[in-house]
Interface confidence: low
């Protein structure tokens, strides 16, 4: 048969939960401390909450059935009677009372024909303001007759026909009634919730609803124009040209910011957005949802997309509607012919209308932003250049920030890319040009996307002109080849000598993509003399060992994930792992990862790695004098000029390295 509607699926679930109590019993969730009842879907059943409020489960006869004394459940179908009497069956006795007052309507409800009545509950009538009720029942009850006729349709309409966004023609001047049928099974009629649906009568059907509904006369644009509280919004809509859409056909939800909402924004930010047609359009579109969303449809958190493309979390807390967890909706369910308006008292500024500074202010990168300011780079981050800011997380600077000098300024300039990027379009091997004139490389790994040594730590925030990439560390542009890096650091004088001796200098100087696990002088010194002599015994063996320290692709620590098997130039694989933020190679910890070079990356290690073939074997080769001599000289030089850089904070190392 045809697919069941969301309402029918929820009813089916309630019936399933109630069947242990007998036939045609439905489980109903009642919000504690209120009279609000809901048929229950799976999620609500397990959470036992509606709008964050606890519920109790009760068991009632499913619509259309009644109890029989002495029998389990609700075995008997309700006897069919006319519409007027069915109003009493569903508990809408006030509607019956007012029907009597009109004189004309009761005969229609008891006579031939086929009608649908959306009957307000007794509570709905009782909650009407006294002056509204008075006006309905005065004027020889004409207003009351009109009001009741607006709740009626001149044919039988069951819930399976109530489709989301449809309109029904009422029996009052053929005025439209708006129907919304939400995925969570809630059905609304002019934003009033269906409480009990599909109660058949001999001459139609009765649906019980939770509000008295009234005719809808104005479109969204007209409501904006009428209300004083929308003075600023009105001007903004006019300036953006969105009024055509808001007075046209369609079904929208406008989260309408009041004058107060605009006043909460600093003048500088507001003036910038109001003076920028594209930012203004994005701002307003971020307050418009693509379909009408009544407050009654929200019983839990729901992600909705605005016309601007941002996802908002619409939820509820008790009787209050929330947006992104904040109760900023001050007036809800103002119906328009083309949708619904909810008044909000905070502006929802989308990223697309923000400067880089504003994006960064809402991210965990405030320390970096202060550094950019202090370095005099503020203009770039608040202007109209197309840029991407690579901003390290605050946690990167937990040991302190660098002094603002020429080196730091240069380093920071290399965190600004001369184009507005989106990470989803970055590809492995791509180069990006910085304001500092450096070319940075993109590395794409299975679970991360890195730019040089720094990896993206959060979703992009795309602003008006700039995009913010939140990075997991300070980015260090390469300062030379792998060979340059090693030669420029006294810790590697013995390694450099070994590389030269093994004839690998050219390899590590030319273009390429290498990961070098670089043993320090201490690593070489820590080798037993036998191992050292074996290593230096012949150039071929030395080259073989050194090639085992060189991976054939660039692997920065952020790209490791849990475990990567990296093929070495020697042929065997290196097991590179990351645990508790410590990189290990063949289970030995890396002392300092991610020293970037133009043709690779250097990871500092304090031991010499042994290829699998070499590990169990004992060999007794004699030392080659020339190689040993190079090592003696390098070792002596190294001891004479030990660097204390390893004790300094990370940034100082970066700056030191840049000075070479």
């Amino acid at each position: 048969g045809p697919a069941k509607s969301p309402y029918q699926l929820v009813l089916q679930h309630s019936r399933l939960r109630g069947r242990q109590h007998g036939p045609n019993v439905c489980a109903v969730q009642k919000v504690i401390g209120t009279n609000r009842k809901y048929f229950t879907n799976c999620k609500q059943w397990y959470q036992r909450k509606i709008c964050g409020k606890s519920t109790v489960i009760s068991y009632e006869c499913c619509p259309g059935y009644e109890k029989v004394p002495g029998e389990k459940g609700c075995p008997a179908a309700l006897p069919l009677s006319n519409l007027y009497e069915t109003l009493g069956v569903v508990g809408s006795t006030t509607t019956q009372l007012y029907t009597d007052r009109t004189e004309k309507l009761r005969p229609e409800m008891e006579g031939p024909g086929s009608f649908t009545i959306f009957a307000p509950s007794n509570e709905a009538w009782a909650s009407l303001p006294a002056e509204v009720l008075d006006s309905l029942v005065s004027n020889v009850n004409i207003e009351l007759l009109n009001a009741l006729r607006y709740h009626m349709v001149g044919r039988r309409v069951l819930t399976d026909e109530l489709k989301h966004g449809m309109t029904l023609t009422s029996m009052y001047q053929n005025s439209n009634i708006q129907i919304h049928h939400y995925p969570n099974g809630i059905v609304t009629v002019n934003c009033a919730r269906l409480l009990k649906a599909d109660h058949h009568a001999t001459n139609g059907v009765v649906h019980l609803i939770d509000k008295v509904i009234s005719t809808i006369t104005n479109n969204i644009q007209q409501i904006i124009e009428i209300e004083d509280t929308f003075e600023t919004l009105r001007a903004a809509v006019a300036a953006s040209g969105l009024n055509t859409m808001l007075e046209g056909n369609g079904q929208y939800t406008l989260l309408a910011p009041t004058n107060e909402a605009f006043e909460k924004i600093p003048s500088e930010t507001l003036n910038r957005i109001l003076g920028d047609p594209e930012a203004l359009r994005d701002l307003l579109n971020n307050h418009i949802l693509k379909s009408a969303m009544c407050a009654e449809a929200i019983v839990a958190g729901l992600s909705v997309e605005t016309l601007e493309g941002t996802t908002l979390e619409v939820g509820c807390s008790g009787d209050m509607l929330t947006i992104n967890g904040k109760a900023i909706i001050s007036n809800k369910d103002i119906l328009a012919t083309n949708g619904v308006i909810h008044y909000i008292d905070e502006l929802l500024i989308p990223d697309s209308a923000k400067t880089l500074f504003e994006l960064a202010a809402e991210s965990d990168v405030s320390t970096a932003i202060d550094l950019f300011r202090q370095a005099g780079l503020g203009n770039h981050l608040s202007g109209s250049e197309r840029l991407t800011l690579l901003a390290p997380l605050n946690s990167v600077f937990k040991d302190g920030t660098p002094p603002i000098d020429a080196h730091t300024r240069n380093l920071l300039r290399n965190h600004i890319i001369k184009d507005q990027l989106a990470s989803k379009y970055l590809y492995h091997g791509q180069t990006l040009e910085t304001l500092g004139g450096k070319k940075l490389r993109v590395f794409v790994y299975r679970n991360s996307l890195c730019i040089e040594n720094s990896c993206i730590a959060a979703h992009d925030k795309r602003g008006r002109y700039g995009t913010l990439f939140t990075m997991d560390r300070v980015l260090t542009p390469p300062m030379g080849t792998v060979m340059d890096v090693l030669k420029g650091d006294n810790r590697f004088s013995m390694l450099v000598a070994a590389i030269q001796s093994a004839g690998l200098t050219e390899t590590l100087n030319r273009e390429g993509v290498y990961t070098v696990f670089a043993p320090t002088n201490e690593a070489f010194r820590a080798l037993p003399p036998r191992e050292r002599s074996r290593l230096l015994g012949d150039a071929k063996e030395l080259a073989n060992i050194l090639k085992y320290h060189i991976g054939d692709e660039i692997l920065v620590s952020g790209g490791i994930g849990a475990l990567v098997r990296l093929k070495s130039l020697q042929g065997d694989k290196l097991e590179v792992s990351l645990k508790n933020n410590v990189v290990s190679v063949n289970k030995e910890p890396v002392a300092e990862p991610d020293i970037m070079a133009t043709n690779g990356v250097v990871h500092v290690i304090t031991n010499v790695l042994q290829p699998p073939a070499n590990r169990p074997q004992e060999r007794g080769d004699e030392l080659a004098d020339s190689a040993l001599e190079i090592f003696k000289q390098a070792s002596a030089f190294s001891r004479a000029s030990q660097r204390s850089v390893r004790l300094a904070p990370v940034y100082q190392k970066l700056l030191e390295r840049m000075k070479h």
């Epitope: 600093p266 003048s267 500074f357 202010a361 300011r373 503020g378 203009n379």
Partner: antibody, heavy 120, light 113 residues
Framework: EVQLVESGGGLVKPGGSLKLSCAAS????????MYWVRQTPEKRLEWVAT????????YYPDSVKGRFTISRDSAKNNLYLQMTSLKSDDTAMYYC?????????????WGQGTLVTVSA | DIVMSQSPSSLVVSAGEKVTMTCKSS????????????LAWYRQKPGQSPKLLIY???TRESGVPDRFTGSGSGTDFTLTISSVKAEDLAVYYC?????????FGGGTKLEIK
Amino acid sequence: EVQLVESGGGLVKPGGSLKLSCAASGFTFSDYYMYWVRQTPEKRLEWVATISDGGIYTYYPDSVKGRFTISRDSAKNNLYLQMTSLKSDDTAMYYCVRGWDRYDSWFACWGQGTLVTVSA
Amino acid sequence: DIVMSQSPSSLVVSAGEKVTMTCKSSQSLLYSSNQKNYLAWYRQKPGQSPKLLIYWASTRESGVPDRFTGSGSGTDFTLTISSVKAEDLAVYYCQQYYRYPYTFGGGTKLEIK
């Protein structure tokens, strides 16, 4: 070094007009919001006018709106304040001020000021 | 308009003493979206123009000695000089840049014994 040099102040009768100028140097003038701030004889500081980096947006307090006009000539690196219908309340030292950057609104660099005296 | 009130209007201290002056705004200067306070402090030495000391309520302008500390949030702000020097003789002003018209406090005159 950032330098802001005001000129054009002097003695003027109530109802009269005066045009203040500010010559800016040591920075890219067109990249900054600029302001006029005045200091009354009682030493109270009052913001008088704002102009955006591109000269598109201008802002004034109610006390001078309609009487004062801020403008800029980025080719000459000059900021101006045209003052008309002057009142005795407008007597003050007028400072030319540079903002921090393209948008932010605190007063980062101040000139030495030019004195305007409105008196019969 | 946002009204800025400073207290005390003047104070006399000896060199080396710690000084605290306060600034109150008639409405909150904390912008919830970025958790920044739109408040600046300036000092004006006799015969000179004002000079920026602090912005964002607590960020020192470069070149400003670290004996100057800005603190506070919302409507209540404080400028503290940890150890006053003779050269700190000046009038200190707070200013809000949260909303036009931008407004200043009346100033706190610091005199040295």
